[in-house]
């Protein structure tokens, strides 16, 4: 008993310590360690039924999807999948967990967000962090050098998510990737085209796609005087420029990451620039940057990319942004990120980004990491941030107070009198067999008013009403729920009439 009391006190003290560290904005690693200690203490404490009421909830960073939310989700997925298929993609699936070794060393600073599974008898496993690394593993394992595929699945990140902004620990990713040796920038341009098609089709508001190139970034850091070992960590600071001011980024680079102030200033001169193809041209003339082989390659490819984007009719949606430095270690070339734009408060102001909704880039070295001979398979791809899109679509529908149908039922089989359950069962079965989406109420003698009310609530457009007289006449009364108009339809014509009214093809092909 004394031991339990001591442990309870330690849990309380450790909890206070964690809160204190968070308030002091202590280092992420220290907070992470102290939180881990707190969890270990709690695990030793175990359940105490007398004190602890089990709180029924989903784990942190996860959520259930209601039928309404699922209806939204399916509509969003439908738009995305149609687009992926329009561009000739095949579909694959991979396990939700991978060997830990597969994921190690692929994500740089983000590796700490990977969920490791408890040992299940020998194999060290981790939940997948994205769909790209498993895709690269799939290519290497199957010795594939050429594929255009999409993959829609859940991924897992041990993040501290702001769920109100559509960020979770378990969330869907919708990825499209092109693997293979092709002429420069053609697949990359198609990926950007796909991104623009999807975001336009979803009608979630105006957007901008920021584009940069890892080689330009690395070249720029080199000429500014950043040592190789600091490239990645400085990248992660630069990437924050869409959220915080240059001053704050500079302070982080100098104060926390040990960069010389004059080096930071040189970086600042570059990364605060954004524009179109004219900026690419301008940088190709830059006396320092144009002398760097990597940067020159990157700028040459971007010039070509802009030509293709113009031909695809999307150049107005693209901005060359030198501050874009996507966090993942595996990018090697072009990188891009789509952000939704808030309407500016006043005319003449710059549009404000409200968060990334899609991103991607070229990763030519990732497959080679899995190949015993290091054979490379060039890849380029994109990922649609559907969770954020779901949130935006849901909010928009709520604001419009739009009713969303959560079922696809075309017709309710109803009866106007008692003792007609058998007839309703026979008719609904006929309709199901003919491919009609039909329902009936699970009552022997439902009131007609209740049946009609159910249709109103569920958004079912038609009611097929059986009555004694109709049975004698060999007809069914077909009623439109919205107009309340009723017509007698011969029983043998009912299927065709329902299909005609609901715009369904007449044969199940």
């Amino acid at each position: 008993m004394a031991e339990r009391a001591a442990l309870e006190e330690l849990v309380k003290l450790q909890g206070e310590r964690v809160r204190g560290l968070k308030q002091q904005k202590a280092s992420a690693e220290l907070i992470e360690e102290e939180v881990a200690k707190l969890l270990k203490l709690k695990a030793q404490l175990g359940p105490d039924e007398s004190k602890q009421k089990f709180v029924l909830k989903t784990p942190k960073g996860t959520r259930d999807y209601s039928p309404r939310q699922m209806a939204v989700r399916e509509k969003v997925f439908d738009v995305i999948i149609r687009c992926f298929k329009r561009h000739g993609a095949e579909v694959i699936d991979t396990p939700v967990f991978e060997l830990k070794e597969t994921l190690m060393g692929k994500y740089g600073e983000d590796s700490k967000l990977i969920y490791d599974l408890k040992d299940q008898g020998g194999e060290l496993l981790s939940l997948r962090y994205d769909l790209t690394v498993p895709f690269a593993r799939y290519l290497a394992m199957n010795k594939l050098t050429n594929i255009k595929r999409y993959h829609i699945a859940k991924v897992y990140r041990r993040d501290n998510p702001a769920m109100t902004r559509g960020r979770y620990r378990e969330f869907y990713q919708c990825d499209f990737d092109i693997a293979g040796n092709f002429d420069p920038m053609i697949p990359d341009a198609e990926c950007l085209k796909i991104m623009c098609e999807i975001l336009s089709s979803l009608q979630i508001g105006d957007f901008l796609v920021k584009v940069n190139d890892r080689r330009i970034l690395d070249g720029m850091f080199a000429i500014c005087g950043v040592s190789d070992s600091k490239f990645r960590t400085i990248c992660s600071s630069v990437d924050k420029l869409d959220k915080v001011s240059w001053e704050e980024v500079k302070n982080e680079m100098v104060g926390e990451k040990g960069l010389a102030p004059e080096v930071a200033d040189r970086i600042g001169d570059y990364v605060q620039q954004h524009g179109g193809v004219s900026l690419v041209e301008q940088l190709l003339q830059d006396p320092k940057l144009s002398q760097n082989k990597q940067a020159l390659e990157g700028l040459g490819d971007l010039k070509l990319l802009f030509e293709y984007l113009t031909l695809f009719g999307i150049d107005d949606k693209i901005s060359f942004d030198l501050s874009l430095a996507r966090g993942l270690d595996y990018y090697t070339g072009v990188i891009y990120e789509a952000v939704l734009l808030q309407t500016p408060a006043q005319a003449g102001e710059e549009p404000l980004g409200v968060g990334s909704v899609a991103a991607g880039g070229r990763y030519d070295g990732l497959v080679g990491m899995f190949d015993p001979k290091g054979r490379k398979v060039p890849c380029v791809g994109l990922s649609i941030g559907v969770e954020r899109i779901f949130s935006i679509v849901e909010q928009r529908l709520e604001a419009l107070e739009e009713k969303i149908r959560t079922t696809e039922t075309q017709v309710l089989v109803a009866s106007a009198q008692k003792k007609l359950l058998e007839e309703r069962l026979k008719l609904v079965s006929e309709l199901w067999d003919a491919g009609i989406k039909a329902e009936l109420l699970y009552k022997k003698n439902p009131k007609l008013l209740n049946q009609l009310q159910y249709c109103e609530e569920a958004g079912i457009p038609l009611v097929a009403i059986i009555g004694e007289q109709e049975l004698k006449d060999g007809v069914i009364k077909l009623r439109s729920v919205t107009s309340r108009e009723e017509v007698d339809v011969r029983r043998e014509d009912l299927v065709e009439e329902i299909k005609r009214r609901t715009g369904q093809p007449l044969c199940i092909c």
């Epitope: 330690l10 003290l13 310590r17 360690e33 881990a36 203490l41 030793q44």
Partner: antibody
Framework: QVQLVESGGGLVKPGGSLRLSCAAS????????MSWIRQAPGKGLEWVSY????????KYTPSVRGRFTISRDNAKNSLYLQMNSLRAEDTAVYYC?????????????WGQGTLVTVSS | DIQMTQSPSSVSASVGDRVTITCRAS??????LAWFQQKPGKAPKLLIF???NLESGVPSRFSGSGSGTDFTLTISSLQPEDFATYYC?????????FGQGTKLEIK
């Protein structure tokens, strides 16, 4: 019962190296943070370093940082301290110690200690 | 680093006496304090953790109190086996530091 047995101490010249080991038994070693604590002859106690249960976190007192490396092998129930560039002021009895309740930085079990003497 | 200051550095007492040793932290450490007993040639032994919790197997004549910066170890009735050196230690933040010790001697 809980047992910690240190080994590897001895006489070494300044600038030399030593590797201390600690063999643990009587508890689930892989669940516990572990530490090295030292005591110079006739002096007080100094917490040198610690390592977390799965080796994810390690820390060192400033005077040894960059010279000492703590490590563990959970499969062998062993804790180690690699000491390089040794100085006269590192002379002490080195104790291997277990954290209280797995993660609390209070040593609830200690070894008998191993003496390290740094002298020319 | 957090400095721990013990007083007195040494104390003489007789069997049956009540003895109090104090420990002061250079900054607030909540209740993250432990007391150890060490006898010559032996490893320290944990007596009290988080200021006032008695480690199992430690006689109830030992007690601890305090929080923040000021802490006390009390031995209510000294026994012959209690003559030793006593150390306090803060477990609030790394590097975890010990007091310089209080030597309890027979009068």
């Amino acid at each position: 019962q809980v047992q910690l047995v240190e080994s590897g101490g001895g006489l070494v010249k300044p600038g030399g190296s030593l590797r201390l080991s600690c063999a643990a038994s009587g508890f689930t070693f892989s669940d516990y943070y572990m530490s090295w604590i030292r005591q110079a002859p006739g002096k007080g106690l100094e917490w040198v370093s610690y390592i977390s249960d799965k080796s994810r976190y390690t820390k060192y007192t400033p005077s040894v940082r960059g010279r000492f490396t703590i490590s563990r092998d959970n499969a062998k129930n062993s804790l180690y301290l690699q000491m390089n560039s040794l100085r006269a002021e590192d002379t002490a009895v080195y104790y291997c110690a277990r954290y209280l309740y797995q993660v609390i930085a209070i040593a609830d079990a200690w070894g008998q200690g191993t003496l390290v003497t740094v002298s020319s | 680093d957090i400095q721990m200051t013990q007083s007195p550095s040494s104390v003489s007492a007789s069997v049956g006496d009540r003895v109090t040793i104090t420990c002061r932290a250079s900054q607030g450490i909540s209740s993250w304090l432990a007391w150890f007993q060490q006898k010559p040639g032996k490893a320290p032994k944990l007596l009290i953790f988080v200021a006032s919790n008695l480690e199992s197997g430690v006689p109830s004549r030992f007690s601890g109190s305090g929080s923040g910066t000021d802490f006390t170890l009390t031995i209510s009735s000294l026994q012959p086996e209690d003559f030793a050196t006593y150390y306090c230690q803060q477990a609030e933040s790394f590097p975890y530091t010990f007091g310089q010790g209080t030597k309890l001697e027979i009068k």
